[in-house]
Interface confidence: low
């Protein structure tokens, strides 16, 4: 038999059919054992394992009456199979039995899909005891069906380790569609064709799945759960839903916007975070990445100075840590700095140009056309050189270091003398006679020590010699820069 | 295969407008642009602007605006450029092409051209 | 809008011979976006190339491109009789989309 309670699931009679033995006028039940939430029956026995019952398993007495005569199978009786009903509504079925009295501690569970229903539903067995027979009603109720209710019911009783189990009740829970799949936000590249899936479920079936762009239907017909919708591209950026419809009405999915991958936002505040001679640390704030992860950054990097010619340094990196170090550059430079980054579409326009200095760096040249001679009268070591190119000194010059270093038999000394900026001459003291001066010469701004010039050596001889030839740097391609006076 | 077919040669008078044609075949009409590219003699390709046809959305090259006027007849699979107040400036090889938009653009298959020429 | 600049203007080669025609965008482009075609006299272009360096379906393995940033080639290995045709870059990063202004390859 099937059932369906549409509007109110009335509860079922406790006897589907005439009950065999005589009850109490009043239809009272000498004993009611209610099992509410946490139902545990209070004469308990241990179930065998679940397993697929076999539906409407009979147990056959061996026992037999004063009389001798055989008592009948013990089987559940007959009742309804099917109940329709509509989700939140109530429901109450049973199953009932008729066992001979001289079974003791007979009890009654409830299973469901192959699980034994152990809490949180209304459970009740009324017991109806006769002369010879008690008649068991075990009733299920449901308060508000759901759709997890869905399922067959049976009951289990264990007489003399025999397990009678009833025939199943179907409860088919009806309602409005139930989603299993919704449409997913997507980032798609534009005028590509992407897949959005839906798919719902009743009961009812079937469920019919209409599609929604930006509030207008896609399709004329109704598709069959699940359904794909193939989009074959878009333009701009779109909103999807679908309707799955059944015969209890139409239920709506959370709307799903499609967003067009474009080419990012120019970065933000790109700022300076160090600067030393020759490089620039930069961090920046990435703009909007056009709905498609960044891949990477380009840093573009142009001479600040009017009279340059304009040509741009390019350095690539990856998009993260929005932080890069510009090295390379020159010292005391202006340059503007933009950043430009890219995703799968394309390149952003560049940030607004920043401008940036770089730091006074120490010379990158030594002095040039360095010369060493010996002044013997006054026991001197006269040096000349010239500055080293203004272009290349990264910075202002402060002054010149210096490096004589004096060897003799066994002896070696270092010593270094500074002097001022203007100067393009020194004088040192001869520190020891019959040895080889060797001296170097670095130029020096705030930046630092420059390199030091190729070293000249002259040599100071004992006390009476008279020599004025001086020593110089070599011209270029002479291997030894030694000249002994 | 892929086949654009362009109408024929047009000689029209200046001041006059004309629309020239552009029939698809060989795929999903509504799935890629329509571009349209100008040619005239001896010189080199000018690109004028696309229309999808799926929703009829369209690009300009801002110097065509209010010269050339894009449209497409899905039913039909055909796109069609009007062009107005012509002058001899005009006159030209006009291509249809299809636009290929994969993260990049470019035109993978073209028209044969439309010819035309303004003359009074 | 990325006007991209094509050199030379006009070639001739003979039948054998290797050709390079460059390509200047005047700004950064995505080597992603530089396309080459192929256009005979009486014809409607033929794409080539796209995305740099990657040969359109039909085109026969001498052609090839490369470059990055604002500068691009089109390379011919072993120019034939039937390469002879004017070649036009073009640029899909950005609207307008622009074509280079074109190199014509004659047969000596």
């Known amino acids: 038999a099937i059932t369906e309670a549409r509007e109110e699931a009335k509860p079922y009679p406790l006897f589907p059919g005439p009950f065999p033995g005589s009850l109490q006028t009043d239809h009272t039940p000498l004993l009611s054992l209610p099992h509410a939430s946490g139902y545990q029956p209070a004469l308990m026995f241990s179930p065998t394992q679940p397993g697929r019952p076999h539906t409407g398993n009979v147990a056959i007495p061996q026992v037999t009456s004063v009389e001798s005569k055989p008592l009948p199978p013990l089987a559940f009786k007959h009742t309804v199979g099917h109940i329709i009903l509509s989700e939140h509504k109530g429901v109450k079925f049973n199953c009932s039995i008729s066992v001979p009295n001289i079974y003791q501690d007979t009890t009654i569970s409830w299973w469901k899909d192959g699980k034994e229903l152990l809490g949180a539903h209304h459970a009740i067995t009324q017991f109806y005891p006769d002369d010879e027979v008690t008649a068991i009603i075990a009733s299920f109720s449901i308060t508000s069906v759901q759709r997890s209710d869905n399922g067959s019911y049976i009951c289990k009783m264990k007489i003399n380790n025999e397990e009678i189990v009833s025939d199943p009740i179907y409860i088919e829970v009806q309602g409005l569609p139930h989603f299993t799949k919704q449409p997913e936000s997507m980032n798609v590249t534009r005028n590509t064709a992407f897949n959005l899936t839906c798919q719902a479920v009743g009961p009812p079936e079937p469920v019919n799945i209409f599609w929604v762009q930006n509030s207008s239907r896609v399709n004329e017909q109704p598709e069959k759960s699940p359904s794909v919708l193939t989009v074959p591209g878009l333009t701009e950026m779109a909103v999807f839903s679908c309707e799955a419809h059944n015969d209890k009405g139409l239920t709506v999915s959370k709307g799903v916007q499609i967003n067009i991958k474009a080419i990012p936002s120019p970065p933000t505040e790109v700022s300076i975070r160090n600067s030393t001679a020759h490089s620039i640390l930069i961090s920046w704030v990435p703009g909007f990445d056009g709905y498609s992860p960044f891949r990477n950054c380009s840093i573009q990097v142009k001479e600040a100075d009017p009279l340059s010619n304009g040509s741009v340094m390019i350095f690539n990196t990856s998009a993260l840590p929005h932080l890069y170090q510009i090295k390379q550059l020159q010292a005391l430079a202006n340059y503007s700095i933009g950043v430009s980054c890219m995703n799968e579409i394309g390149w952003s326009a560049v940030s607004p140009w920043i401008l940036a200095s770089t730091t006074e760096g120490a010379p990158s040249v030594a002095p040039l056309n360095v010369t060493v001679f010996l002044n013997e009268s006054s026991d001197n070591v006269d040096i000349r050189w010239m500055k080293p190119p203004t272009k290349q000194q990264d910075g202002e010059l402060v002054g010149y270091r210096i490096s004589h270093v004096w060897q003799s038999a066994g002896i070696s000394k270092e010593l270094l003398e500074e002097v001022g900026q203007n100067g393009s001459r020194a004088r040192i003291s001869v520190q020891v006679h019959n040895a080889t001066c060797t001296v170097r010469i670095a130029a020096v701004t705030r930046g630092g020590v420059g390199p030091f010039s190729d070293p000249v050596k002259i040599f100071i001889p004992a006390h009476g010699w008279v020599d004025y030839a001086p020593s110089s740097t070599p011209a270029p391609g002479n291997a030894d820069p030694v000249l002994i006076i | 295969q892929v086949q654009l077919q362009q109408s024929g040669p047009e000689l029209v008078k200046p001041g006059a407008s004309v629309k020239l044609s552009c029939k698809a075949s060989?795929?999903?009409?509504?799935?890629?642009?329509i571009n349209w590219v100008k040619q005239r003699p001896g010189l080199g390709l000018e690109w004028i602007g696309w229309i999808y046809p799926r929703d009829g959305y369209t690009k300009y090259n801002e110097k065509f605006k209010g010269k050339a006027t894009l449209a497409v007849d899905t039913s039909s699979s055909t796109a069609s450029m009007e062009l107005h107040s012509l002058t001899s400036e005009d006159s030209a090889v006009y291509f249809c092409?299809?636009?290929?938009?994969?993260?990049?653009?470019?035109?993978?298959?073209w028209g044969p051209g439309t010819t035309l020429t303004v003359s009074s | 809008e990325n006007v991209l600049t094509q050199s030379p203007t006009t070639v001739a080669a003979s039948p054998g011979e290797k050709i390079t025609i460059t390509c200047s965008a005047s700004s950064i482009i995505s080597s992603n976006y530089l396309h080459w075609y192929q256009q005979k006299p009486g014809f409607s272009p033929k794409l080539l190339i796209y995305?740099?360096?990657n040969l359109a379906s039909g085109v026969p393995a001498r052609f090839s491109g490369s470059g990055s940033g604002t500068s691009y080639s089109l390379t011919i290995g072993t120019m034939e009789a039937e390469d002879a045709a004017t070649y036009y870059c073009q640029q899909g990063r950005s609207v307008p989309l622009t074509f280079g202004a074109g190199t014509k390859l004659e047969l000596k």
């Open positions: 995305r740099t360096s």
């Open positions: 060989g795929y999903t009409f509504t799935t890629y642009d």
């Open positions: 092409a299809r636009g290929y938009y994969d993260n990049l653009y470019y035109f993978d298959n």
